[in-house]
């Protein structure tokens, strides 16, 4: 039975050209995390494997940095980075848990005025 829950940084906004940290945390389960996949829409951004460590997809290696922890740092943000991001926790024996973050990348002047998502 899957008892765990994933907490995320929620719905966030960031400034064009800046950086953002995507964070997920799996709680309420004793299952072993074997791998965490980070996806943007249907594209794989990065993998953190418990045994093999981090792998960043070649097409994102210039703008994606591993960490902190099991999180992911996106750099040199563009408006095209707006969208959904998923953290997919592969665990044993529970199975797969998925968390979702929606990122809006704002023009600098908008971001400076504190536009933020409302967390549901």
């Amino acid at each position: 039975m899957m008892t765990g829950t994933i907490e995320t940084t929620g719905n966030i906004s960031a400034e064009k050209g800046g950086s953002i940290i995507l964070q997920c945390h799996l709680s309420s389960t004793t299952a072993q995390v074997t791998q965490v996949n980070w996806e943007q829409q249907d594209q794989l951004l990065a993998i953190c494997n418990a045994d093999l460590g981090w792998h960043i997809s070649p097409s994102f290696k210039d703008r994606v940095a591993p960490g902190p922890g099991l999180g992911l740092t996106l750099q040199s943000l563009t408006v095209n980075d707006t969208g959904e991001y998923f953290c997919i926790y592969h665990t044993y024996p529970d199975g797969t848990y998925t968390g979702r973050i929606f990122l809006e990348v704002l023009e600098s002047s908008v971001a400076e005025h504190g536009a933020r998502f409302q967390i549901p």
Epitope: N11, G83, E84, T98, R100, F102, E104, Q118, P120
Partner: nanobody
Framework: QVQLVESGGGVVQPGRSLRLSCAAS????????MGWFRQAPGKERESVAA????????YYADSVKGRFTISRDNSKNTLYLQMNSLRAEDTAVYYC??????????????????WGQGTLVTVSS
């Protein structure tokens, strides 16, 4: 409880257009992120398009980009999918889905709370 009813499906020749509608019951339609999904015979359900509750954010699957347009009319509690340049591979049952609340669009089926019964689109010459 939200009820979703799709309409507008049918048989159409390749290259032609169709517009699907999804009528929603419920008082808070304007707060629902919504999406269109489809399932072809013998295949898994896949996302087609999705839109945030305020219409600011839109998602399209790569296979329909530039051909399909999702839109909504909050005054009519209706979601639309305009499908142009239809292809045989677009043949499927199309489902409308809604989520109670949330920010941005939701491209994956697991996040939706309510589903319609579907409308069949057949693209054939």
């Amino acid at each position: 409880q939200v009820q979703l009813v799709e309409s507008g499906g049918g048989v159409v020749q390749p290259g032609r257009s169709l517009r699907l509608s999804c009528a929603a019951s419920g008082p808070s339609f304007s707060s629902y992120p919504m999406g269109w999904f489809r399932q072809a015979p013998g295949k898994e359900r896949e996302s087609v398009a999705a839109q945030s509750s305020d219409g600011r954010f839109t998602y399209y699957a790569d296979s329909v980009k530039g051909r399909f347009t999702i839109s909504r009319d909050n005054s009519k509690n209706t979601l639309y999918l305009q499908m142009n340049s239809l292809r045989a591979e677009d043949t499927a049952v199309y489902y409308c889905a809604a989520r109670d609340s949330g920010s941005g669009y939701y491209s994956r089926a697991q996040w939706y709370d309510y589903w319609g019964q579907g409308t069949l689109v057949t693209v054939s010459s």
